[in-house]
Every structure is written in structure tokens, then in C-alpha cells.
């Protein structure tokens, strides 16, 4: 039978060394014995590459291509294939699809003062343009009251956040998780990093008095 | 050490045919991209055809599209230009040189880094 | 198609001296930052051409720091300070950005 592309493949990069993209088929797939996505930079001299697609669900294909670090003028030329057959071609330019990696290594000291120190790792090393064009949004929750959650906005540069003791309930188990995003590239946000949990140890001052 | 060593070059008539060789060695030849360059007689140097390192993507001068054509064997880390109809202002040294690394993604520039000694083309009646 | 001009067409420069030739592209040749896809060569009488500078001001595998190289965008310049005789020859710029590739029409540099 004819095989049709239900959803155009969209396509996200990391700006460092992955570009992933994900299209959804007219049925289920076997997203690696059907189907090629080849990927050619629009530069002189450039080769054609081949990614071979991964199923994510029954008919949705997925395929992460290894690109150079990222700049501002790449323009790489896709073309979907299905043995012969030419399903889709399109476009695609990394620096206008930006999805950040996610940041790594999420954890909560105590600090002086009644205070939680949040900590994470940029997932950028230092010469990359986006580590310094990163801001994170970061999101503590109860695990027992869905509705006790708060969200924070880092904007400056250090990848911490100091959080209050009081403001959260005493004796509570809560959870953070933390994503980023760049503003300059209109990223989308990055996938939210692994949840961390701690215990609110703090005693509100009525019950010192 | 890297060579390039061009032969093929010979006195032809206008409208005939010649095939140029480039023989490479010291290096990964099927990585880079080979380039042709020629230069008539007391002119300046101008650029005639790129070839990939695969093979699968070739360009050309305006001057030549259509009758030359660059092709290359990996295997025996040879480059060739094959000239068509041949006219008096193909009259020239033609040399190869080594451009661009290919293999990677964004192919890796380096100018053309190294030159052939040329081999001399003469279209005459 | 993009278009090179060099300027001047022939220098005559005493040993010691420096030496400069400019190089003008019709479009700008950065592709990204620090990334201009600009080359110098240099063809000695009777010889090949040689490899001097690329990507702009970077230097070739055992070209002598004299030579140097600077500009970004569509203008450039080859600087040969501390003139030897050997230098003689003809000076070509080449851009390497996009098909058809080209070249400045040459700079003839003679020794005094």
C-alpha cells in the first residue's frame, strides 16, 4: 500500500550537536525498516547523510542527526523517503528552531537563614552561544497537595535560586524540577530536567513563642 | 608527503576531447574535496570544478558546464576532468588542488591546500 | 556570482619593507563569526600556485608568520611584512564561500 505522512516532520536542535526531528505517519510504522530521512547542509562541498528514524509511538518516527556545532547561517535540506518514494522535502535552519538541552544535575542545600539553596549545571559549555543566552524556569511542588506549587523566573546568569524556608509548608515533602529556555534564539522551553526531592524541615516562629 | 601529479594534457583540435588525471597520494584521499583550477597563458588563475569527497556532488564554472565533467575513483585515489568540445580558450594549465575536508557535516576549510605541478591543454587547428 | 577585485595590480617594494594588498568581494564572504571564507596564494615565476592564508588570517601549514592576513566580511588584506626576494611572484585572493568559486585577477609583487 501508498505510505502518507499524517503531520510534516518538525525538527528542534540543541545548537551544540543534535537536531531531532518527529513526524506522525497515516498508520502504524516500522519507522526504521520503511523510512530515510536524508539531511545535506546547504554549503559547497557538503555530503548527504542518512538518519534512520525511531518509532516514539505505533505510527510516530523520530531520528536525531549529529550536526556540527550550530551557526547562525546553517541551512540543512531534508528529504523523507520511503524506499524510493519521496513522502516529503523540506527546509530547516537550527538557529530558528532552537529547543535548549536540558540542564543537569538538580539539587537543594540548606543554606544560612532558613533558606534552600537550588543548584543545577548549565547544559552548555562555556564557548557555546547559549550558555550565556540561557533563563530557567524552575517549579517546586508539594508531593501531597497538587495544588501547593510555585514557579520561578532565572533571569541572571548563575544557575541557583534561593527559596525561602517559609514559604513553603513545614514538614512538607516537595519536589523541583528546572527548564530553560533562550530568549535571543525564541527558543521553545527545553524538556524539564529529573525531579529532586526534600523534606521542608523549617518551623514557622509561632511555635518558638 | 602529499602529491598530486597531473597528466593528460595534449595538443587537441577545437570541438575534440582530452581526459585529465590527477593521481593523489599522502593523504585520505576520499575525505577532501578536489578541486581544478586552470590558468591560460600569461592570465590569471581561474576556478573550473569541485567534486566532493564521495563523488555526489559536483560543481562547475560556467565557462565549462555542460562539456566538462569531474569525477574521481576512491579506489585508485585518482581525480579526473573529462573536456568536450573543446574550444581555443580551454588553452591552458590545469591544475588539481586539495580543498575542503567533506567527511564531516560542515565540511572543514582549509583554502586549497595543496597544488598538482599542472599538465598544459593547447586547443588549436 | 561573486565577484574579486585586488588592488593594486603590481607593487614594487624594497627588501625589509612592508608590503599590502587589498581584496574586495562583491558580497560579504562570513559565513559566521570569525569564519570568512577568503584565501591568499602565491605563485612564484615558473611555479604552482601556493597556499598562504585561509579562512581569512589564518596561516597555511609552513607559511612564515611575515605573512598575515586580516578583513572580515568583503574587504581584506594581505600584509607581507619584512619583504624577502623570494617573495616575488604573483598574490591572488580566492573566495571559497560559494559556487562558482573566484579569483582576484592577481598582484604582481617585485622586489627592489
Known amino acids: 500500500g501508498s505510505v502518507k505522512v499524517l503531520h510534516e516532520p518538525s525538527c528542534f536542535s540543541d545548537y551544540i550537536s543534535t537536531s531531532v526531528c518527529q513526524w506522525k505517519m497515516d498508520h502504524p510504522t516500522n519507522c526504521s525498516a520503511e523510512l530515510r530521512l536524508s539531511y545535506q547542509l546547504d554549503f559547497m562541498g557538503s555530503e548527504n547523510h542518512t538518519c534512520v528514524p525511531e518509532n516514539r509511538e505505533d505510527s510516530v518516527c523520530v531520528c536525531s542527526m549529529p550536526i556540527d556545532d550550530a551557526v547562525e547561517a546553517d541551512v540543512y535540506q531534508l528529504d523523507l523517503w520511503a524506499g524510493q518514494q519521496l513522502l516529503w522535502s523540506g527546509s530547516f535552519q537550527p538557529s530558528k528552531h532552537v529547543k535548549p538541552r536540558t540542564p543537569g544535575n538538580l539539587t537543594v542545600h540548606p543554606n544560612i537563614s532558613h533558606t534552600w539553596l537550588l543548584m543545577w549545571t548549565n547544559p552548555y559549555p562555556t564557548e557555546n552561544h547559549l550558555h550565556s543566552e540561557l533563563t530557567y524556569m524552575v517549579n517546586v511542588s508539594n508531593d501531597n497537595d497538587p495544588e501547593d506549587f510555585k514557579v520561578y523566573n532565572v533571569t541572571y546568569m548563575g544557575p541557583t535560586l534561593r527559596l525561602a524556608a517559609s514559604t513553603l509548608k513545614s514538614g512538607a515533602s516537595y519536589s523541583a524540577r528546572v527548564r530553560a529556555w533562550a530568549q535571543t534564539y525564541n527558543s521553545t522551553w527545553s524538556d524539564w530536567s529529573p525531579s529532586t526531592t526534600w523534606l521542608n524541615y523549617y518551623e514557622p516562629w509561632e511555635q518558638h513563642l | 608527503e602529499v602529491q598530486l601529479v597531473e597528466s593528460g594534457g595534449d595538443l587537441v583540435k577545437p570541438g575534440g576531447s582530452l581526459r585529465l588525471s590527477c593521481v593523489a597520494s599522502?593523504?585520505?584521499?576520499?575525505?577532501?574535496?578536489m578541486t581544478w583550477v586552470r590558468q591560460a597563458p600569461g592570465k590569471g588563475l581561474q576556478w573550473v570544478s569541485l567534486i566532493s569527497g564521495s563523488g555526489g556532488k559536483t560543481y562547475y564554472a560556467d565557462a565549462v558546464k555542460g562539456r566538462f565533467t569531474i569525477s574521481r575513483d576512491n579506489a585508485k585515489n585518482t581525480l579526473y576532468l573529462q573536456m568536450n568540445s573543446l574550444r581555443a580558450e580551454d588553452t591552458a594549465v590545469y591544475y588539481c588542488?586539495?580543498?575542503?575536508?567533506?567527511?564531516?557535516?560542515?565540511?572543514?576549510?582549509?583554502?586549497?591546500?595543496?597544488w598538482g605541478q599542472g599538465t598544459l591543454v593547447t586547443v588549436s587547428s | 556570482d561573486i565577484v574579486m577585485t585586488q588592488t593594486p595590480l603590481s607593487l614594487s617594494v624594497s627588501p625589509g619593507e612592508t608590503a599590502s594588498i587589498s581584496c574586495r568581494s562583491s558580497?560579504?564572504?562570513?559565513?559566521?563569526?570569525?569564519?570568512?571564507?577568503l584565501d591568499w596564494y602565491l605563485q612564484k615565476p615558473g611555479q604552482s600556485p601556493q597556499g598562504l592564508i585561509y579562512l581569512g588570517s589564518k596561516r597555511a601549514s609552513g607559511v612564515p608568520d611575515r605573512f598575515s592576513g586580516s578583513g572580515s566580511g568583503t574587504d581584506f588584506t594581505l600584509r607581507i611584512s619584512r619583504v624577502e626576494a623570494n617573495d616575488t611572484g604573483v598574490y591572488y585572493c580566492?573566495?571559497?564561500?560559494?559556487?562558482?568559486?573566484?579569483f582576484g585577477q592577481g598582484t604582481k609583487l617585485e622586489i627592489k
Open positions: 588542488a586539495v580543498d575542503r575536508l567533506t567527511k564531516t557535516i560542515r565540511p572543514q576549510y582549509y583554502g586549497l591546500w595543496h
Open positions: 558580497q560579504s564572504l562570513l559565513y559566521s563569526i570569525g569564519y570568512n571564507y
Open positions: 580566492m573566495q571559497g564561500l560559494q559556487s562558482p568559486l573566484s
Open positions: 599522502g593523504f585520505t584521499f576520499r575525505d577532501y574535496a
